[in-house]
């Protein structure tokens, strides 16, 4: 059988290294050798490249080496496949070396900010040594912030043949570390060089970008003052490296700026004690270069009715995220504040918050939350300066079996009945939503019985027991991950009811 006709011929010119062609099929059923016929020097010269007859593996590739590679040039390439039965020739293919030239990557030697020019980095590189000296090179510059996985790209060409080349990358974030990598190709070529080694540079610092501001309203104290916990953080989109020297806070009752009070702090939280009226609070951050724009918050009067628009909320888990979605009856509300913190018996140590815009869902990576911990999640609608009624839910990113079972006791022991009471497992030991309790009980040397009840039941009366019999009993609390038994208790049913016994006694 004749060999298959060589097809899909693809050639690439590795500048000053080789000219390599590949084709299909890569393997033949019977032993096949190949001859690649080339015309070059614009068709004046011709030669061949043979695959090694001793190579019995994949040899659907052949390379022409210097000094017979000249550039610029046009080549024709034809592949002949030969086996014991004969020869099969490919079609003749035509190659312009400029269009298939691949050169070495450039070498970036500096990425620096230019004094006084904001949000710009100047990249300097050395044009590859192995590149045609007179040709225009096209470049792709890839860049990303150091903590991002997402690359951005900019394309440009350089016509000069200067060995030391530069490009000014503008519209960057202030005071941010960027990773840069560069590739190049002759302007007409379809093949790019590899990427250069990555280089890091930092844009110049500026006055702070801005703040996100939030509050927790606490119950009024006996003297009528209201504690308001203010908290702020760098606004979303602010440079990662941005450092504030401090924060200025000023606040006053609505329509009464004469009563303005000011505070300076280096913390990112501050507790204010306000009266019952509506207050306005303003916060700016500052560094050596200036102040951020003002962050504003309206604190409603104590008796103000807040609007309610969230109708329902669901928390669901994906592979690696917790997603909270909500439904709203107010289409005009498009900003929401999400609060989340662990539901613990003591005061929560970590309280987090985040603004959501133009969406009715909020997503957090599972690994940002602790497994086996219950989180309280509240969503507040925000309409201009008004904050509405929150809607809250609870969620676990991962449930486990409880760390301890319920503490149980037997009350009201009768002849054939007993009332079992157990305590809720402390929040810190639940490790998931308790979905039910199961009471396991067994007479001495008897069969074990069980009864499962809802999680809101903490007491159960067992009936149809055998009189004057010792029983062992334990209660298991279950989450979606499984159950944990509480301590085993023992009790013995009475031989005669107390009621009957007393009656008898009187006679």
């Amino acid at each position: 059988v004749l060999p298959a006709k060589p097809e899909n011929i693809s050639c690439i010119f590795y500048y000053e290294e080789n000219f390599t062609c590949t084709w299909s099929p890569e393997k033949e059923a019977s032993y096949t050798w190949y001859k690649v016929k080339r015309t070059y020097s614009y068709g004046y010269k011709s030669d061949i490249c043979s695959t090694d007859n001793s190579t019995r593996g994949n040899h659907a590739s052949c390379s022409f080496l210097p000094p017979t590679i000249t550039n610029p040039d046009n080549y024709t390439i034809q592949v002949e496949a030969q086996n014991a039965d004969g020869i099969m020739k490919s079609d003749i293919t035509y190659w312009n070396l400029d269009a298939i030239m691949k050169i070495e990557p450039p070498e970036i030697f500096s990425v620096k900010s230019v004094l006084g020019i904001k949000r710009m980095l100047q990249i300097k590189w050395i044009r590859p040594v192995l590149a045609p000296h007179s040709s225009t090179l096209k470049y792709t510059l890839r860049f990303r912030t150091i903590n991002s996985a997402y690359w951005m790209e900019v394309n440009f060409t350089k016509e000069d043949i200067d060995r030391d080349e530069t490009y000014n990358l503008t519209e960057l974030q202030a005071f941010t570390e960027y990773v840069m990598t560069l590739r190049c190709a002759p302007a007409e070529s379809m093949f790019w060089s590899g990427w250069s080694q990555e280089k890091v540079g930092t844009t110049e610092e500026e006055a702070p970008y801005g703040l996100d501001l939030w509050r927790v309203l606490k119950p009024a104290m006996v003297d009528g003052r209201r504690p308001v916990q203010l908290m702020w953080k760098k606004a979303t989109g602010a440079p990662v490296l941005e450092k504030a020297l401090g924060y200025n806070i000023w606040y006053f009752p609505e329509n009464n700026t004469n009563l303005t009070e000011t505070v300076n702090t280096t913390n990112q939280t501050h507790e204010l004690y306000l009266g019952g009226k509506t207050y306005w609070v303003y916060v700016v951050s500052y560094n050596s270069l200036g102040e951020s724009p003002v962050a504003t918050l309206r604190i409603p009067a104590l008796n103000e009715k807040t609007f309610q628009c969230i109708e329902a909320m669901q928390a669901c888990l994906t592979q690696d995220q917790l997603v909270v979605e909500w439904q709203s009856s107010a289409p005009e509300v498009d900003t929401w504040m999400v609060e989340w913190f662990p539901d613990v018996d003591s005061e929560p140590s970590s309280f987090s918050w985040e603004s959501v815009s133009q969406a009715r869902n909020w997503t957090i990576q599972k690994d940002e939350l602790k497994p086996l911990w219950c989180y309280n999640i509240s969503v507040y609608p925000v309409l201009r300066d008004r904050v509405g009624q929150p809607y809250s839910t609870q969620a676990y990113v991962q449930e486990g079996i409880p760390s301890a079972g319920p503490v149980t006791q037997a009350d009201s022991i009768g002849v054939k009945t007993v009332t079992i009471t157990w305590k809720e497992i402390p929040k810190s030991k639940r490790n998931g939503f308790i979905k039910n309790y199961t009471i396991f009980y067994q007479a001495e040397d008897g069969k074990e019985f069980s009864k499962t009840v809802n999680s809101n039941i903490l007491q159960y009366r067992l009936e149809s027991l055998t009189r004057r019999t010792s029983y062992s009993l334990q209660v298991m609390a279950s989450t979606n991950a499984g159950g944990t038994n509480g301590t085993k208790i023992n009790f013995k049913t009475l031989s005669i009811s107390h009621h009957h016994h007393h009656h008898h006694h009187h006679h």
Epitope: K37, S41, Y42, G43, S46, D47
Partner: antibody, heavy 117, light 112 residues
Framework: EVQLVESGGGLVQPGRSMKLSCTAS????????MAWVRQAPTKGLEWVAS????????YYRDSVKGRFTISRDNAKSTLYLQMDSLRAEDTATYYC??????????WGQGVMVTVSS | QFTLTQPKSVSGSLRSTITIPCERS????????VSWYQQHLGRPPINVIY?????PSEVSDRFSGSIDSSSNSASLTITNLQMDDEADYFC???????????FGGGTKLTVL
């Protein structure tokens, strides 16, 4: 339409010089190697000389090396053959031809050069 | 330096098939493309086969080219001979060692 038109032939005495020209049209002259091929009366074709696209590389048959010079003017789309120290055996019809893919795809009509005293 | 050897003459009757061989003296015939030219008396040559077996679009499909490694030669085959096929035929290849084109001595085809 590709056209190659030779000029400059005629009768010349042995030892003297002559310059042939070939004016090309209908294609991008600077993209092709060009050649001169001759044919002595009643004899076969004999390649004489070739020149690269930019004129930097030239090739000659041994019998004309040092006597003939091939050159080109890409701006004028013209090929030249300067023939010095002409001999009787140089008598032939000289064809201007275009190289491509290892062969000559277009030929001029030819110009006769007679070297005789 | 190799030579290409052709028979001085070949003849064939009208509408028959003839083959003109072209033998390479040294080196592999398959290492460099072979082309063929037809030359009528007093006219410049025209190319009828290039790259061993490729035919220019304006040339009749009665003309075909091939190479045979066992005899280290190329062949031009003309089928259904016509009177107008009477001409001189030259093979040509390239000598990569000395970087020059090489012509065969030519074959005179007579149509009987």
């Amino acid at each position: 339409e590709v056209q190659l038109v030779e000029s400059g032939g005629g009768l010349v005495q042995p030892g003297r010089s002559m310059k042939l020209s070939c004016t090309a049209s209908g294609f991008t002259f600077s993209n092709y190697y060009m050649a001169w091929v001759r044919q002595a009366p009643t004899k076969g074709l004999e390649w004489v000389a070739s020149i690269s696209t930019g004129g930097g590389n030239t090739y000659y048959r041994d019998s004309v090396k040092g006597r003939f010079t091939i050159s080109r003017d890409n701006a004028k789309s013209t090929l030249y053959l300067q023939m010095d120290s002409l001999r009787a055996e140089d008598t032939a019809t000289y064809y201007c031809a275009r190289h491509t893919m290892g062969y000559f795809d277009y030929w001029g009509q030819g110009v006769m050069v007679t070297v005789s005293s | 330096q190799f030579t290409l050897t052709q028979p001085k003459s070949v003849s064939g009757s009208l509408r028959s098939t003839i083959t003109i061989p072209c033998e390479r003296s040294s080196g592999d015939i398959g290492d460099n493309y072979v082309s063929w030219y037809q030359q009528h008396l007093g006219r410049p040559p025209i190319n009828v086969i290039y790259a061993d077996d490729q035919r220019p679009s304006e040339v009749s499909d009665r003309f075909s080219g091939s190479i045979d490694s066992s005899s280290n030669s190329a062949s031009l085959t003309i089928t259904n001979l016509q009177m107008d096929d009477e001409a001189d035929y030259f093979c040509q290849s390239y000598d990569g060692k000395i970087e020059i084109p090489v012509f065969g001595g030519g074959t005179k085809l007579t149509v009987l």
